[in-house]
Amino acid sequence: QLPPGKPEIFKCRSPNKETFTCWWRPGTDGGLPTNYSLTYHREGETLMHECPDYITGGPNSCHFGKQYTSMWRTYIMMVNATNQMGSSFSDELYVDVTYIVQPDPPLELAVEVKQPEDRKPYLWIKWSPPTLIDLKTGWFTLLYEIRLKPEKAAEWEIHFAGQQTEFKILSLHPGQKYLVQVRCKPDHGYWSAWSPATFIQIPSDFTMND
């Protein structure tokens, strides 16, 4: 029987900069029941606070609701693991909510085959940013990535769309049914999950791009 091993806070995420959650990995338990507590203070403060919510984020997590979340202050946090034989602490972790945003997937994905008379046909893809993300403030730059593949293919074809919310694709296999998805990330955050797939049938007379 031993004191617990050193825990590690390995992940913090915010869906929209208004709330956030951090998760830790326990160290070895030393063969005894172990209690974990997360304490934190914010830059410029000396007063330590305990995690306000150990439930919402699931096991080994701390959730900071709206009233506990500030974009203006860096959070300094650590996890304490305690059993009957002693305690151990994680390294201190510094968190700036701006840099942990993982948005929801983009919305309203629409896909259409366009066949202009005077130009090559193309696949036109359009979407909207996730609702929770406020792009008007200016500091939030969302980047988008599209993936598509014929229904029975194993490999996805990936296109980086930058900041635009629409995209054209010229090279497609005629007569095939394609799956299309889109995801987004803030410039210094994390990729969202892929949006639900949208299906599109490519007409047999669709001319491949040279």
Epitope: T74, L93, Y94, V95, D96, T98, Y99, W139
Partner: antibody
């Protein structure tokens, strides 16, 4: 404890390439961005770029686009920077650094001295 | 790119004195999220830089309270009260508000 291990020195020929390594230990490698910084002898520091090891997403200083390529090997918790078409201007100490969930970095490797010489 | 101008380039001090280093940026370092990402590093001879102060005035873990940072917008100052021998080296200011991140040219703190 957090460590970023870099080789001490590399001697390379002009016109060739060199791939510098930065082996991370003491933390979950995919959690934090890795930055690269150049320091010429007796001079200041220049930020080259950064990479997110979780998905290999990169941001570069325009000045180093085409000169530096940042990659990671998640299986060995190692970040790499390849420098191409080397000239005497590339002779410098190159540091890797690690951020927290922030845009500034507190942990630095010991640096690799690259000497470009025939 | 944001140019960071440090003064003085060299600062001779006596042990126990107060030292003050100035850093001026060519544009405001207030991020659109309201934070100011101005930091100070110390590089001792033959070593990699070490973080002292982050976001203008916050001491990093383990940094003695004789180090303090202040300023706003484009003008920033690092003060060292009662300089000790272990404080000697080159001090760099750095900004991470704008990409590319940039550094000052350094101020060498040396014994008078």
């Amino acid at each position: 404890q957090v460590q970023l291990q870099q080789p001490g020195a590399e001697l390379v020929m002009p016109g060739t390439s060199v791939k510098l390594s930065c082996k991370a230990s003491g933390y979950t490698f995919t959690s934090y961005w890795i930055h690269w910084v150049k320091q010429r002898p007796g001079q200041g520091l220049e930020w080259i770029g950064e990479i997110d090891p979780s998905d290999s997403y990169t941001n570069y200083n325009q000045k180093f686009k085409g000169k530096a390529t940042l990659t990671v090997d998640r299986s060995s918790s190692t970040a790499y920077m390849q420098l191409s078409s080397l000239t005497s201007e590339d002779s410098a100490v190159y540091y890797c650094g690690r951020s927290f969930f922030t845009n500034w970095f507190a942990y630095w490797g010991q640096g690799t001295l690259v000497t470009v010489s025939a | 790119d944001v140019v960071m101008t440090q003064t003085p380039l060299s600062l001779p001090v006596s042990l126990g004195d107060q030292a003050s280093i100035s850093c001026r940026s060519s544009q405001s370092l207030v991020h659109s999220n309201g934070n100011t990402y101005l930091h100070w590093y110390l590089q001792k001879p033959g070593q990699s830089p070490k973080l002292l102060i982050y976001k203008v005035s916050n001491r990093f873990s383990g940094v003695p309270d004789r180090f303090s940072g202040s300023g706003s917008g484009t003008d920033f100052t690092l003060k060292i009260n009662r300089v000790e021998a272990e404080d000697l080296g080159v001090y760099f200011c750095s900004q991470s508000t704008h990409v590319p991140f940039t550094f000052g040219s350094g101020t060498k703190l040396e014994i008078k």
